[in-house]
């Protein structure tokens, strides 16, 4: 049986099998077609979704579609159902929490009454000024916060204390790539983990432990990506996996925070990666330890210089590293979370591409989050 | 676009009361708190007091308690202030000005063209 | 009430200057701060809020600074449509008080 079951897949009416190289290879094989059923499938980047969280306090922002503005939501008459339609409209299924903060004299943008139609938020028609001046902070998930802190230094051996939301991605039980546990049922990592292999049976997760082969595998239900886009070949590389079940937090187990919208990091904002990628370039042998390290932001304009990436570096990519070279994830480490530490942990970038490992010209790249959100949140939604 | 259009200059004798209107066009009226501002010939700038337009609720500084009324029309999108028991000292231009975003201590983007005041016998 | 000065009271300077005028208030206000310049015979126009946030379509050669007690104006290259007078004024408690304002002239 496990000799059928890795080489063949079988079909159902009438049950026959075919070899397991035709499953999401585009053609259907199975006469009911489910051999293209579990595979990769794309999912568009959607339309813009109507609410979105500052890096001001958490604070809640609904757009008018009618004028293409947003606006700060008032804290005035704010109710919990208020804050669940929000986090809804962003995909998120767990009880969020929302607090008042007070507006700021820097408020830059004009603040109302949010009331709810058909499931989304609105605008309040001909509400008066906020009566309260504070604005709406809102929490959709609890994440981002861990056991232990790391220490600032270069490379060293890490802990699932410090990491909680660090996951093994396996295909035949062989980690092919990092990922970050974004909410129970949510894994993010890049694409090009799945270039090889685009079926989903054979993929697994495994979280909870730092070390590579001692944690039970999780199953997936689907993996999910955004069309290919020629004119921007590097781009988009990020995908969501859906876990069969949900998972259980702990200590050891824990959601990281998206990045707000506007969280736009100033070259040389301190970094963290970890991975159990390559340690040298080229060879060397896969970590079994999950290793950590220290980097910053590297500023694009130089990142995209004549001894760099040449312009390969879009607006939707950010680099990371050290000026002088030698701190950088490998092979194995891609899908691997780039993450900054505010009051939570947030991952801000995914291990992605680059030339070569650990070179003073040539960071890593890594797919900026910020830029998916809104395509994070159309996938969520259209899953929940 | 936002506009603040006063009424016309005033002459009043001392003791008298004025009435200054404001009508704003361009945004929601009730949305945002109108300021009154006042600046006697050559001298600097005055606060005087705010209005709600949504609810009506107002605020005074001290020195204009009791004298002071600021009242608005939503149908006409229009606030008035109205300052009592003239003296030659209050001779001076009058401002209605429109908070920059919907909230009290946002600071005055949009200005009516002013209302000269003149309280002479 | 919350007292705002500002000094100095009057400056002359030439086009291209640095000017530069201070604004302190006689408790602390944090960042509730705001900048206007007034030309003869017009409304006040806001060129700064909270301290140091640039008015949508004011010159960048506006700029501000400070927080607690003492703020600055500057303007890094005066220009001829630059010559008015500039009031600060404090929204951090009511009531919103002005500063008496400084007279920027030509030299």
């Known amino acids: 049986k496990v000799i059928l079951d890795k080489y063949y897949f079988l079909c159902g009416q009438p049950l026959h099998f075919i070899p397991r190289k035709q499953l999401c290879d585009g053609e259907l094989d199975c006469p009911l077609g489910e051999d293209e059923e579990h595979c990769v499938k794309s999912f568009p980047e959607g339309p813009a979704v109507a609410v979105r969280l500052s890096k001001d306090r958490s604070t809640l922002q609904v757009l008018d579609s009618a004028t293409g503005n947003w606006f700060s939501a008032c804290f005035d008459n704010f109710t919990e159902a208020l804050a669940e339609t929000a986090c809804r409209q962003m995909g998120y299924s767990s009880k969020p929490t929302f607090r008042a903060v007070e507006i700021g004299p820097d408020q830059d943008l004009d603040v109302v009454e949010i009331t709810e139609n058909s499931q989304e938020l609105r605008m309040r028609n001909s509400s008066g000024p906020c009566l309260s001046g504070s604005l709406v902070s809102l929490h959709c998930l609890a994440c981002g916060k861990s056991l232990k802190t790391p220490r600032v230094v270069g490379v060293e051996e890490a802990s699932v204390d410090s990491w909680p939301w660090q996951v093994s991605i396996q295909y035949d039980k062989q980690h092919v790539c990092g990922g970050s546990i974004l909410d129970p049922h949510w894994v993010l990592t890049a694409a090009h983990c799945f270039r090889k292999h685009t079926d989903v049976f054979n993929w697994k997760v495994r979280a909870g432990s730092d070390k590579l082969g001692s944690f039970p595998s999780l199953a997936v239900a689907k993996i999910i990506i955004i069309e290919f886009n020629p004119m921007y070949p590097k781009d988009n590389d990020i995908a969501l996996m859906k876990l069969q079940f949900p998972l259980t937090f702990s200590g050891t187990v824990r959601p990281i925070c998206l990045p707000f919208f506007d969280e736009e990091l100033t070259p040389a904002t301190p970094l963290w990666i970890i991975g159990w990628g390559f340690t040298k370039q080229n060879g060397g042998k896969m970590s079994d330890i999950l290793l950590q390290a220290s980097v910053q932001v590297i500023d694009s304009t130089r990142c995209n210089a004549d001894d760099a990436y040449q312009g390969e570096v879009t607006e939707k990519m950010m680099c990371a590293g050290i000026p002088e070279g030698g701190v950088d994830t490998c092979q194995g480490d891609s899908g691997g979370p780039l993450m900054y530490q505010s009051d939570q942990w947030h991952v801000v970038g995914i291990v992605s591409w680059g030339y070569g490992c650990g070179g003073p010209s040539t960071p890593g790249v890594y797919t900026k989050v910020s830029a998916y959100l809104n395509w994070i949140y159309n996938v969520w939604k259209a899953e929940l | 676009q936002v506009q603040l259009v006063q009424s016309g200059a005033e002459v009043k004798k001392p003791g008298a009361s004025v009435k200054v209107s404001c009508k704003a066009s361009?945004?929601?009226?009730?949305?945002?708190?109108m300021q009154w501002v006042r600046q006697a010939p050559g001298q600097g700038l005055e606060w005087m007091g705010w209005m709600n337009p949504n609810s009506g609720n107002t605020g005074y500084a001290q020195k204009f308690q009791g004298r002071v009324t600021m009242t608005r029309d939503t149908s006409t999108s229009t606030v008035y202030m109205e300052l009592s028991s003239l003296r030659s000292e209050d001779t001076a231009v009058y401002y209605c000005a429109r908070v920059r975003i919907g909230w009290l201590q946002s600071p005055p983007l949009y200005w009516g063209q002013g209302t000269l005041v003149t309280v002479s016998s | 009430d919350i007292q705002m000065t500002q000094s100095p009271s009057s400056l002359s300077a030439s086009v291209g200057d640095r000017v530069t005028i201070t604004c302190r208030a006689s408790?602390?206000?944090?960042?509730?701060l705001a900048w206007y310049q007034q030309k003869p015979g017009k409304a006040p126009k806001l060129l700064i809020y909270?301290?140091?946030s640039l008015q949508s379509g004011v010159p960048s050669r506006f700029s501000g600074s400070g927080s607690g007690t003492d703020f600055t104006l500057t303007i890094s290259s005066l220009q001829p449509e630059d010559f008015a007078t500039y009031y600060c004024?404090?929204?951090?408690?009511?009531?919103?008080?002005f500063g008496p304002g400084t007279k920027v002239d030509i030299k």
């Open positions: 361009g945004y929601t009226f009730t949305s945002y708190y």
């Open positions: 909270a301290a140091s």
């Open positions: 408790q602390g206000i944090s960042n509730y």
């Open positions: 004024q404090q929204s951090y408690s009511i009531p919103f008080t």
